[in-house]
C-alpha cells in the first residue's frame, strides 16, 4: 500500500481467483484514543472500533472511503483504491491501446519544434468518475523538471456503438536546450483513477523522435509563361524552431489528381519553392520534415491547381 | 579545414558530408537485421557515447562566439563512432550484408573527422566503452542502439555545419 495523495491510498493486488489479497491497517488521524468507530462509504454499518482498523482487501467491495468517527463526528477519511496485477502485469483497463506506432501504446505525444514543449493525448471509452494526473521529467534517476498542465477532454468521437473520449495535456521542459543532442529521455507518467480503480501509464521518448512540424504556410502558385508548369512556393511554419539556417526542414511536393487512383507526382526539395506541372482539376500539396532527423512528416498544406 | 588555433573549417564541404552522414545513418538502421529487441531494450547505452550537450557551444550563438569548442566536440564524437563501427560489434556475428551502408557510413565518419582535423594535430579523443557483447543477439541490439544514437549525433552536427555554411563561411 502507498499514498497517492493526502488521504488517498493505493492497494496493489495480485488479481486471480481466490487470491489472498492484502492486509491493510488504517489509522485514524486523531489524538483521540477511545470511542472511535469505522464505516465504509455511505454505509452506517460499523466495521470495527479503535484507533486502527485491520482489513483484508481482496476485491473492489473492500475498497472505498473508510471513515473514522467519534460520537457522530467525522475524525478522518482514508480512500482506498485498487491497482490490479494479473499474471505479473498491471491492468490497463481505463485507457485504450492506440496500437500506433506499436501495440501497448496508451499515451501518444508530439512536439511542433525543439523548444521542449510537447502535447500528449490518450483515449478512453469511460465518460464518468474519471480523473487523470500527469507528471513528467527529463530522465528518471536524477530527474530534471518538466511542467505539465491539467489533462483536459479534447475531443469526443463516435466509434461504432461506442463513444470515445480523447484527453490531452501540454507539458514544457523547464530548462530546454533546443540545439543539444538529447541523452536522457523525457518520461511522462499518467495516473488514472476510475471509480475505485487505479492505473498508471508511462511513456518515454526523446523530443527529436516525437517532432511533427506544422504544415508549411503561405502555399502559393505562380504560373510560368507559355508553359503548363507552375512555381509553387511556401514558407516555414511559424511554430518551427529558429534560426532556419540551423533548424532546417526538407519538403515533399505532391501533385494529386481528383481521383485517388491517379498517379501522384512527388518532388523532394530542401528549398521553399519547386516547379511542377499542374494538371487540370489536380491539387498541389506540400509537407515538411526535419531535414536531418527522420521524425514525422507534417500534415499536407494544399492548394487547387486551377 | 579546422586548423587548430581558431581558423574556420571548410563549412560547405562539412555541410555536404554531414548531410550525407545523416542519410547513411538512417539507411543503415533498418538493414542491420530484423529486430524486436529494440522495442524493449532501454536506453542505457546512451550513457556510454559522447553527446553534444548544452554547454558545448553548438547552438547558433555559441558558434558565432567561438566555433572551436563545438567542432572539437563533433570531432570527438566522429572518431568515437568511427571506432565503434569498426569494432567487433559490427564486424562480428551476425555478419552484415556485403552491400550494407554501414561500410560507407564508417568511411564517411572518418572522412568528416579528417576534414575537421588535419594531420599532425590531435584533439583529445574519448575512450571507446567496453559494451562487451558476447552473443549475436547482443551485438544486434547494440548495432541498433549505436545507429540510433549516431542518427541523433549527426543530426546536430549537420545543423551546425548547415548554419556555419550559411552564416560563418568567409
Amino acid at each position: 500500500i502507498w499514498e497517492l495523495k493526502k488521504d488517498v491510498y493505493v492497494v496493489e493486488l495480485d488479481w486471480y481467483p481466490d487470491a489472498p489479497g492484502e492486509m491493510v491497517v488504517l489509522t485514524c488521524d486523531t489524538p483521540e484514543e477511545d470511542g472511535i468507530t469505522w464505516t465504509l462509504d455511505q454505509s452506517s454499518e460499523v466495521l470495527g472500533s479503535g484507533k486502527t482498523l485491520t482489513i483484508q482487501v481482496k476485491e473492489f467491495g473492500d475498497a472505498g472511503q473508510y471513515t473514522c468517527h467519534k460520537g457522530g463526528e467525522v475524525l478522518s477519511h482514508s480512500l482506498l483504491l485498487l491497482h490490479k496485477k494479473e499474471d505479473g502485469i498491471w491492468s490497463t483497463d481505463i485507457l485504450k491501446d492506440q496500437k500506433e506506432p506499436k501495440n501497448k501504446t496508451f499515451l501518444r505525444c508530439e512536439a511542433k519544434n525543439y523548444s521542449g514543449r510537447f502535447t500528449c493525448w490518450w483515449l478512453t471509452t469511460i465518460s464518468t468518475d474519471l480523473t487523470f494526473s500527469v507528471k513528467s521529467s527529463r530522465g528518471s534517476s536524477d530527474p530534471q523538471g518538466v511542467t505539465c498542465g491539467a489533462a483536459t477532454l479534447s475531443a469526443e468521437r463516435v466509434r461504432g456503438d461506442n463513444k470515445e473520449y480523447e484527453y490531452s495535456v501540454e507539458c514544457q521542459e523547464d530548462s530546454a536546450c533546443p540545439a543539444a543532442e538529447e541523452s536522457l529521455p523525457i518520461e511522462v507518467m499518467v495516473d488514472a483513477v476510475h471509480k475505485l480503480k487505479y492505473e498508471n501509464y508511462t511513456s518515454s521518448f526523446f523530443i527529436r523522435d516525437i517532432i511533427k512540424p506544422d504544415p508549411p504556410k503561405n502555399l502559393q502558385l505562380k504560373p510560368l509563361k507559355n508553359s503548363r508548369q507552375v512555381e509553387v512556393s511556401w514558407e516555414y511554419p511559424d511554430t518551427w524552431s529558429t534560426p532556419h539556417s540551423y533548424f532546417s526542414l526538407t519538403f515533399c511536393v505532391q501533385v494529386q489528381g481528383k481521383s485517388k487512383r491517379e498517379k501522384k507526382d512527388r518532388v523532394f526539395t530542401d528549398k521553399t519553392s519547386a516547379t511542377v506541372i499542374c494538371r487540370k482539376n489536380a491539387s498541389i500539396s506540400v509537407r515538411a520534415q526535419d531535414r536531418y532527423y527522420s521524425s514525422s512528416w507534417s500534415e499536407w498544406a494544399s492548394v487547387p491547381c486551377s | 579545414r579546422a586548423v587548430p588555433g581558431g581558423s574556420s573549417p571548410a563549412w560547405t564541404q562539412c555541410q555536404q558530408l554531414s548531410q550525407k552522414l545523416c542519410t547513411l545513418a538512417w539507411s543503415a538502421h533498418p538493414l542491420v537485421g530484423h529486430m524486436d529487441l529494440r522495442e524493449e531494450g532501454d536506453e542505457e547505452t546512451t550513457n556510454d557515447v559522447p553527446h553534444i550537450q548544452c554547454g558545448d557551444g553548438c547552438d547558433p550563438q555559441g558558434l558565432r562566439d567561438n566555433s572551436q569548442f563545438c567542432l572539437q566536440r563533433i570531432h570527438q564524437g566522429l572518431i568515437f563512432y568511427e571506432k565503434l563501427l569498426g569494432s567487433d560489434i559490427f564486424t562480428g556475428e551476425p555478419s552484415l550484408l556485403p552491400d550494407s551502408p554501414v561500410g560507407q557510413l564508417h568511411a564517411s565518419l572518418l572522412g568528416l573527422s579528417q576534414l575537421l582535423q588535419p594531420e599532425g594535430h590531435h584533439w583529445e579523443t574519448q575512450q571507446i566503452p567496453s559494451l562487451s557483447p558476447s552473443q549475436p543477439w547482443q551485438r544486434l541490439l547494440l548495432r541498433f542502439k549505436i545507429l540510433r544514437s549516431l542518427q541523433a549525433f549527426v543530426a546536430v552536427a549537420a545543423r551546425v555545419f548547415a548554419h556555419g555554411a550559411a552564416t560563418l563561411s568567409p
Epitope: - | H34, E40, G41, E93, P94, Q135, W137, Q138
Partner: antibody, heavy 121, light 111 residues
C-alpha cells in the same frame, strides 16, 4: 515446416569418438544458429555448444577440449564430434535451432526428437 | 557460469488452479534492458518445447494461460489455470552469457 533430425550411433565404447549429424529442413543454416543440448537419463538439460550463422562456434567450457561443431550449409547439415567418450556422457542428444537473433535473444525455438547415445564397453 | 535455481522442485496443483514456478539466476541475465530468460516445457519421451522467450513473450501456438514475468535475476512462470495436459517438467534457460545454462527443472503434477 521446420524440422531437425539427429542421426548417429546408438552405442559408443569408452574413449571412442562420437559423431552425430543434424539434418535440418524448412530453413537455412545461413539464417539460424544451431545448438547441441544433451540430457542424461532422468536428469536435466545441458547445453554443449553452438554454431552461428557465419560458422563461428562457442562451446561449453566444461567439455570444450573434446567438442567440435561444424556445418555444411549446402547440405543443411550440422555435425557434432565429441572425443574420448565416457559412460557419464550417456544421454539423449538434441539438435536445436536458436530463434531469430533479433527476436528471441538466444531462445531455442525448434528441437529435434533427439537421439539416445549409450557409452558402454 | 550463471547458475539457475528453480523452485520448487515439484509442485502439485488442482485442475483449474494456479501454478507458479520461480527461477533465480546467480547474476543478472539482462543486457541493456533485454532479459535473456526463456521457459520450456518437457513432457515424458518428448523434447523440450519453448513456451516463453525473453522473460515474458508467449511463443506462438502456446495457450494464453502461460505467462512469464521478471527481470535481472528473478523470474516467474505462471500457469493461470492448470489443465491436465500441462503435467510436465518445466525448465528456465539463460542465453545472456556462455555457456547457456538451464535450471534444474520443476515437475508439475495434478493434486
Amino acid at each position: 515446416q521446420v524440422t531437425l533430425k539427429e542421426s548417429g550411433p546408438v552405442l559408443v565404447k569408452p574413449t571412442e569418438t562420437l559423431t552425430l549429424t543434424c539434418t535440418v529442413s524448412g530453413f537455412s543454416l545461413t539464417n539460424y544458429a544451431i545448438s547441441w543440448v544433451r540430457q542424461p537419463p532422468g536428469k536435466g538439460l545441458e547445453w554443449l555448444g553452438v554454431i552461428w550463422t557465419g560458422g563461428g562456434t562457442n562451446y561449453n567450457s566444461g567439455i570444450k577440449s573434446r567438442l567440435t561443431i561444424s556445418k555444411d550449409n549446402s547440405k543443411s547439415q550440422v555435425v557434432l564430434t565429441m572425443t574420448n567418450m565416457d559412460p557419464v556422457d550417456t544421454a539423449r542428444y538434441y539438435c536445436v535451432r536458436e530463434g531469430d537473433y533479433g527476436s528471441y535473444a538466444g531462445a531455442m525455438d525448434y528441437w529435434g526428437q533427439g537421439t539416445t547415445v549409450t557409452v558402454s564397453s | 557460469d550463471i547458475v539457475l535455481t528453480q523452485s520448487p522442485d515439484s509442485l502439485a496443483v488442482s485442475l483449474g488452479e494456479r501454478a507458479t514456478i520461480n527461477c533465480r539466476a546467480s547474476e543478472s541475465v539482462d543486457y541493456y534492458g533485454i532479459s535473456s530468460m526463456h521457459w520450456f516445457q518437457q513432457k515424458p519421451g518428448q523434447p523440450p518445447k519453448l513456451l516463453i522467450y525473453r522473460a515474458s513473450n508467449l511463443e506462438s501456438g502456446i495457450p494464453a494461460r502461460f505467462s512469464g514475468s521478471g527481470s535481472r535475476t528473478d523470474f516467474t512462470l505462471t500457469i493461470s489455470s492448470l489443465q491436465a495436459e500441462d503435467v510436465a517438467v518445466y525448465y528456465c534457460q539463460q542465453a545472456n552469457k556462455d555457456p547457456y545454462t538451464f535450471g534444474g527443472g520443476t515437475k508439475v503434477e495434478i493434486k
